[in-house]
């Protein structure tokens, strides 16, 4: 997860009402028993704030200590604040837990900006609004950090939901979800519905609001409309996928599809923006600028540095194009597309206290580490991380923000040839590949 442009958590207001759904298509493949249907106890178990992350309540230790934990599909460590910090209201106190076990090993995690470090141990962990189970999981007790915790974000730790390959200090440290599946009967899948409010929320509104749902072990029908479309997980490290085509208002960007996945494309709930490789970002912005040329914007707006405001209620959504990403499908030569609206890629700015203006930042930015489908994408969709079948599903979220003219969409199938060629193969750098 690129820590720095961290995720937007906004309340689930303004979308289609839950339960108001399009008719289910009949050709969906059947799921294993117990993995579908209603997960009432887990619906609405996420909260948060724009740009600061979606979090779930968890308990750690015996007796249980309650903490709010950021849900992050772009990393693989379960790490919690374990020492006083000016931005933390509470922290994990290992000395108060009778079930804590010290692993006598340190861990250090640097980010582009900032870092955290801590001590590894294990303890009993449960999720009050999750499956009714308790697991012994690895925990990194954060003792020192820099630019990691966010003032006012209301979370005290991070739940890395990706695979062991990217766990720190190495892949021998079993991630939380692996422990959960191994120790219980919870199916090896989870799904996320992140709900953007479409408008900024103050602190009290956030605490009272719903930010979305993390359904552990299944899929909840009430959280999406239409059909789920699946794309293969290319490799189990990050949740890596392959983008095969990009369109702005239906116009193909016409780039070599390898560029879209250079050096990878991942689905990351811990990143706020849709982040695109430099060349792709430049082409996309050029196309978005052209499509919205009836309005003028400062240069800094397109760099995500400057906000743009309109008088409350007059945001010209119609001048901004929709953005479609085509993803590799499960069948040879078949793809499907996910389409987001400006309501997803223009992020409401919360620090603007004035009720006279609606202010936004452009939430598409440049990346040097590949495409990151952050909250900007995820807020449009119900996203199923089907680890058991090595695939990620997308359906239109029942809580996505839209207007009376356009809605986010998941559509297919489309015929796309040579999709395997779109994947970028990162060169190996370990000694075994350095031939002398």
């Amino acid at each position: 997860t690129q820590h720095g442009i961290r995720l937007p958590l906004r309340s689930g207001l303004g979308g289609a009402p839950l339960g108001l759904r399009l008719p289910r298509e009949t050709d969906e493949e059947p799921e294993e028993p117990g993995r579908r249907g209603s997960f009432v106890e887990m619906v609405d178990n996420l909260r948060g704030k724009s740009g600061q992350g979606y979090y779930v309540e968890m308990t750690v230790g015996s007796p249980p200590q309650t903490l709010n934990i950021l849900v992050d599909t772009g990393s693989s460590n379960f790490a919690v604040g374990a020492a006083p910090h000016p931005f933390l209201h509470r922290y994990y106190q290992r000395q108060l837990s009778s079930t804590y076990r010290d692993l006598r090993k340190g861990v250090y995690v640097p980010y582009t900006q900032g870092k955290w470090e801590g001590e590894l141990g294990t303890d009993l962990v449960s999720i009050p609004h999750g499956p009714n189970v308790t697991v012994r999981a690895n925990i990194a007790a954060i003792t020192e950090s820099d630019k990691f915790f966010i003032n006012g974000s209301n979370w005290e730790g991070i739940l890395g939901l990706a695979y062991a390959e990217i766990a720190r200090p190495d892949d021998s440290l079993e991630p939380f979800f692996d422990s959960l599946v191994k120790q219980t009967h919870v199916p090896n899948l989870f799904s996320l519905q992140l709900c953007g409010a479409g408008f900024p929320l103050n602190q009290s509104e956030v605490l009272a609001s719903v930010g979305g749902s993390m359904i552990i072990g299944g899929i909840d029908h009430s959280l999406y409309t239409g059909s789920l479309w699946y794309t293969p997980i290319r490799r189990e490290w990050y949740y890596e996928v392959i983008i095969v085509r990009v369109e702005i208002n239906g116009q193909d960007l016409k780039m070599d599809c390898k560029e879209y996945n250079y050096d990878k494309s991942i689905v990351d709930s811990g990143t706020t923006n849709l982040r695109l490789p430099k060349k792709v970002f430049e082409a996309a912005v050029k196309s978005i600028k052209a499509a919205s040329s009836t309005e003028k914007f400062p240069d800094g707006f397109w760099l995500g540095e400057q906000l743009v405001c309109w008088q409350a209620g007059t945001t010209p959504w119609n001048i901004f194009p929709v953005i479609s990403l085509y993803l590799m499908g499960e069948v040879t030569n078949q793809s499907f597309r996910i389409t987001i609206l400006p309501q997803q890629y223009l992020r409401p700015v919360e620090d603007v206290a004035t009720s006279q203006d609606d202010c936004y930042k452009f939430a598409i930015s440049q990346s040097s580490t590949g495409t990151v489908m952050g909250a900007v994408i995820m807020e449009g969709f119900y996203v199923v991380f089907d680890r058991a079948r090595k695939r990620i599903g997308f359906a239109v979220s029942a809580c996505h923000v839209h207007d009376e003219f356009r809605t986010a969409a998941v559509e297919g199938p489309f015929v796309t040839l040579d999709m395997e060629d779109c994947g970028y193969n990162i060169p190996q750098t370990d000694e075994s590949t350095l031939m002398t």
């Epitope: 309005e295 003028k296 914007f297 400062p298 240069d299 800094g300 400057q306 743009v308 405001c309 309109w310 008088q311 007059t314 010209p316 203006d357």
Partner: nanobody, 123 residues
Framework: DVQLQESGGGSVQAGGSLRLSCARS????????MAWFRQGPGKEREGVAA???????TYAGSLQGRFTISQDNDKNTLYLQMNSLKPDDTAVYYC?????????????????WGKGTQVTVSS
């Protein structure tokens, strides 16, 4: 030729509010960009807020949330509503108009300037 005349400045206690106005007169040509700048004692002139064609607006990051720029319907008067004022906001506030460019808060993008109105915020 286009003339700009600011008004509404004055002295106020910290935490107070002021509303500045800028009346545009002369010239029939459409000038799409209007902005407020300020110059504090011993400081360079800095952009506060700008508006394009009475619609899209932007603000200097540090002021965002306390100041609101607006224009009346005929686009002949520009306003700056300033709330929760701080001693650091003490400056001469200038109204500017121009044909704009890439950076809406850069003085060089503006051809027409008012003479300024003094705002003093005391603690």
């Amino acid at each position: 030729d286009v003339q700009l005349q600011e008004s509404g400045g004055g002295s106020v206690q910290a935490g107070g509010s002021l509303r500045l106005s800028c009346a545009r007169s002369g010239g029939t040509v459409s000038i799409p960009y209007m902005a407020w700048f300020r110059q504090g004692p011993g400081k360079e002139r800095e952009g506060v807020a700008a508006i394009y064609d009475g619609r899209a607006k932007t603000y200097a990051g540090s002021l965002q949330g306390r100041f609101t720029i607006s224009q009346d319907n005929d686009k002949n008067t520009l306003y700056l509503q300033m709330n929760s004022l701080k001693p650091d906001d003490t400056a001469v506030y200038y109204c500017a108009a121009g044909n704009g460019g890439g950076n809406w808060l850069r003085p060089s993008e503006y051809n027409y300037w008012g003479k300024g109105t003094q705002v003093t915020v005391s603690s």
